[in-house]
């Protein structure tokens, strides 16, 4: 039987009974938060062979092995993952071994086995036989291997039963527990699975099979399951479902959901039966089961019961996330906030149409309205008293409405009103009149020329750059010396710069009046010599990175015909030079024959340019004679090798430590102090652990019902 869509067993171990008849869990399996130690020996689920998503175990007291619970679990597909992992075993206080001796394949995702104080038999499992890539596995904070003394079946009797493989240059027996070997298929099967008797399964089988070369005898399917057969693709008139089986249209139409969006049911798209159309697509009609591409962002209509939605905080803006059409009026009143511009853009940036009016008042935190970056139509179906559909009053720091060179905004009905916006130049308002088609609608008092822009440099001259020079982490720029009518009015220059992967930034991006600014700022004093052009060296930059730079003249508020003159440059885009890439990551090597090594690695985290090739160097190393001095099959004879960790425990040293000259003296070497890079790596590691733990807690802890 198929169970699902995900099973969450918590608090009471007797809930495990829910797994009784399951052969496939279509979804995830959580077993967690069982704080009372129980005897699990009476619980056994031999029917369960496949979990299509992931398996998560967390704080289950008294559970010592998973092998008795799930003796036949063969495949975890990882169709959906838990924070990139298909198998998570976290803080299992009593778990002594994993013991999933029939687990043969984790199709997607990595494993995370962390903080299990009693857990052994981790180094005896060759995960590369189960997963495609082991480099993302995270196995940390479990019982130290030297305290485990893991022995595979038959090793003590000197009749080893398990097969050997090489992990990290260690050729060793592979097993799950003291009496269960890790199953390996004959090399003749290649990537295929095999039966218990080592006969190769059909290529469409995954994990194992009950008969050789038979696509109806698979324990699990490599691709898809349909009508008892494993198939490479779903047959005509059937559709992929949950990444593992084929279903017909009728089945898809009859799936019921508890999601609030279920009023229209599942859809069929691109050969798959899914809950809703994927990003960029929309249903072809309200009761349709099929999707068509959206023109631009997919429409999402949001409506405010009270007709007017007040945006006075990030929280209130959050309610509009994803909305493209807002039915009602927007009242924006943002007096303060942290990182407000980018937060508002995140939540309101998709709004294209407002059916009523837009009113912006007392929003002292706003420098620009560019957070409404897709607004293209204000219908003005409802208007403020005086027939206003765009109303801007008393915004002390508002300097820009939108970047009119890249913006089309239409106000279909109603007038505009602007008053008491001291930093908003009237020219900006006049430009909006032209773009929005409202020119001629406003009466004289609707745009106040005295109290809009009275504290801004509204007549701007253009500063021109004269030279630019780049290196891998520096940019040198110079510009024409600005000469206002009275040279004493020029105080200094401010250079603004930031990383800009694309040439689409504006001066007001990410900027608000509360200190948040995505631009870095540097003040540049005037050169004492009047003939020297001002310039700056920007350093500490990243190699092979495009930066946006512009310069502003800082002038006295010199009034000329009621206007303040200022000067600024256009935005200049400039790329730093390439540099040496950082080291390739996760280098792994393994031998697959007596004359070959396979070396794998991931690209460097900082390519610092376009990577064109890698250089691989190798050299032969002398064999370590130490390996031949002991009988490793006898447990009590295994010497414990302790590597330098800054201390030496005399009892554990089985032979005289090598002495080398260290710091000018003979004697055992101390561990070198950690380099900055190592300290940074440790810090990042700790941070990563915290992020995962937070994710885990946030995902699984739910408030008790009222």
């Amino acid at each position: 039987e198929i169970c699902g869509p995900g099973i969450d067993i918590r608090n009471d171990y007797q809930q495990l009974k829910r797994l009784e008849n399951c052969t496939v869990i279509e979804g995830y399996l959580h077993i967690l938060l069982i704080s009372k130690a129980e005897d699990y020996r009476s619980y056994r689920f031999p029917k369960l062979t496949v979990i299509t998503e992931y398996l998560l175990l967390f704080r289950v007291a008294g559970l010592e092995s998973l092998g008795d619970l799930f003796p036949n679990l063969t495949v975890i597909r990882g169709w959906k993952l838990f924070y990139n992992y298909a198998l998570v075993i976290f803080e299992m206080t009593n778990l002594k071994d994993i013991g999933l001796y029939n687990l043969r394949n984790i199709t997607r995702g990595a494993i995370r086995i962390e903080k299990n104080a009693d857990l052994c038999y981790l180094s005896t499992v060759d995960w590369s036989l189960i997963l495609d890539a082991v480099s993302n596995n995270y196995i940390v904070g479990n019982k130290p291997p030297k305290e485990c003394g893991d022995l595979c079946p038959g090793t003590m009797e000197e009749k080893p039963m398990c097969e050997k493989t090489t992990i990290n240059n260690e050729y060793n027996y592979r097993c799950w527990t003291t009496n269960r070997c890790q199953k390996m298929c004959p090399s003749t099967c290649g990537k295929r699975a095999c039966t218990e008797n080592n006969e190769c399964c059909h290529p469409e089988c995954l994990g194992s099979c009950s008969a050789p070369d038979n696509d109806t005898a698979c324990v699990a399917c490599r691709h898809y399951y349909y009508a008892g057969v494993c198939v490479p693709a779903c047959p005509p008139n059937t559709y992929r479902f949950e990444g593992w089986r084929c279903v017909d249209r009728d089945f898809c139409a009859n799936i019921l959901s508890a999601e609030s969006s279920d009023s229209e049911g599942f859809v069929i798209h691109d050969g798959e039966c899914m809950q809703e159309c994927p990003s960029g697509f929309i249903r072809n009609g309200s009761q349709s089961m099929y999707c068509i591409p959206c023109e631009g962002p997919c429409p999402k209509v949001c409506e405010e019961e009270k007709k007017t939605k007040t945006i006075d905080s990030v929280t209130s803006a959050q309610m509009l996330q994803g909305c493209t059409i807002f039915k009602g009026n927007l009242l924006i009143n943002i007096r303060r906030g942290n990182n407000i511009a980018s937060e508002l853009e995140n939540f309101m940036g998709l709004i294209e149409v407002v059916t009523g009016y837009v009113k912006i008042r007392h929003s002292h935190a706003l420098v620009s309205l560019s957070f409404l970056k897709n607004l293209r139509l204000i219908l003005g179906e409802e208007q403020l008293e005086g027939n206003y559909s765009f109303y801007v009053l008393d915004n002390q720091n508002l300097q820009q409405l939108w970047d009119w060179d890249h913006r089309n905004l239409t106000i279909k009905a109603g007038k505009m009103y602007f008053a008491f916006n001291p930093k908003l130049c009237v020219s900006e308002i006049y430009r909006m009149e032209e773009v929005t088609g409202t020119k001629g609608r406003q009466s004289k008092g609707d745009i106040n020329t005295r109290n809009n822009g009275e504290r801004a440099s509204c007549e701007s001259d253009v500063l021109h750059f004269t030279s630019t020079t780049t290196s891998k982490n520096r940019i040198i720029i110079t510009w024409h010396r600005y000469r206002p009518p009275d040279y004493r009015d020029l105080i200094s220059f401010t250079v603004y710069y930031k990383e800009a992967p694309f040439k689409n930034v504006t001066e007001y991006d990410g900027q608000d009046a509360c200190g948040s600014n995505s631009w870095n700022m540097v003040d540049v004093d005037l050169p004492p010599n009047k003939d020297v052009e001002p310039g700056i060296l920007l350093h500490g930059l990243k190699p092979w990175t495009q930066y946006a730079v512009y310069v502003k003249a800082v002038t006295l508020t010199m009034v000329e015909n009621d206007h303040i003159r200022g000067a600024k440059s256009e935005i200049l885009y400039i790329r730093t030079n390439a540099s040496v890439p950082s080291i390739p990551l996760d280098v792994l090597s393994a031998s697959n024959s007596s004359s070959q090594l396979i070396v794998k690695w991931n690209p460097p985290s900082l390519p610092n340019g376009n990577l064109s090739y890698y250089i691989v160097r190798w050299q032969r190393q002398p064999q370590d004679g130490y390996l031949y001095r002991h009988n490793y099959c006898s447990k009590d004879k295994i010497p414990i090798r302790k590597y330098a960790d800054g201390t030496i425990d005399i009892e554990e040293v089985t032979e005289n430590p090598k002495t080398e000259v260290c710091g000018g003296e003979k004697g055992p070497c101390c561990a070198c102090p950690k380099t900055e890079a190592e300290k940074q790596a440790e810090k990042e590691e700790a941070e990563y652990r915290k992020v995962f733990e937070n994710f885990l807690h946030n995902s699984i802890f739910v408030p008790r019902p009222e």
Epitope: E1, I2, P5, R18, F251, N254, I255, S257, E259, S260
Partner: nanobody
Framework: EVQLVESGGGLVQPGGSLRLSCAAS????????MSWFRQAPGKEREFVSA????????RYADSVKGRFTISRDNSKNTLYLQMNSLRAEDTAVYYC????????????????WGQGTLVTVSS
């Protein structure tokens, strides 16, 4: 977790009507797909009807289509089954079941079950 209690069963004549109720407690009711199953004496449990979390969509077994109507009231945490034109073969213990997130047409292993209420159709 979720507790389900059925009521409304009883003895009814062929052609008659009956309304079953299922009261739920313990978790947000609307986050579950709700179903009715039935088990006649000596037979396997069979699916009768199911309804989505919002109540906007439902499905029925062929044997009850047109005669039975499933509904839910999320404000009262209650599931209903209105049974009309009852037949002798409708005699069974009727179970209410809940499953989180969703339910596929072939799903039998629901997460939570009630104890059942007996419906007897006889003259």
């Amino acid at each position: 977790e979720v507790q389900l209690v059925e009521s409304g069963g009883g003895l009814v004549q062929p052609g008659g009507s009956l309304r079953l109720s299922c009261a739920a407690s313990g978790r947000t009711f609307s986050s579950f797909v709700m179903s009715w199953f039935r088990q006649a004496p000596g037979k396997e449990r069979e699916f009768v009807s199911a309804i989505s979390g919002s109540g906007s969509r439902s499905r029925y077994a062929d044997s009850v289509k047109g005669r039975f109507t499933i509904s839910r009231d999320n404000s009262k945490n209650t599931l209903y089954l209105q049974m009309n034109s009852l037949r002798a073969e409708d005699t069974a213990v009727y179970y209410c079941a809940a499953n989180p997130r969703r339910a596929t047409p072939d799903l039998i292993q629901y997460a939570y079950w009630g104890q059942g209420t007996l419906v007897t159709v006889s003259s």
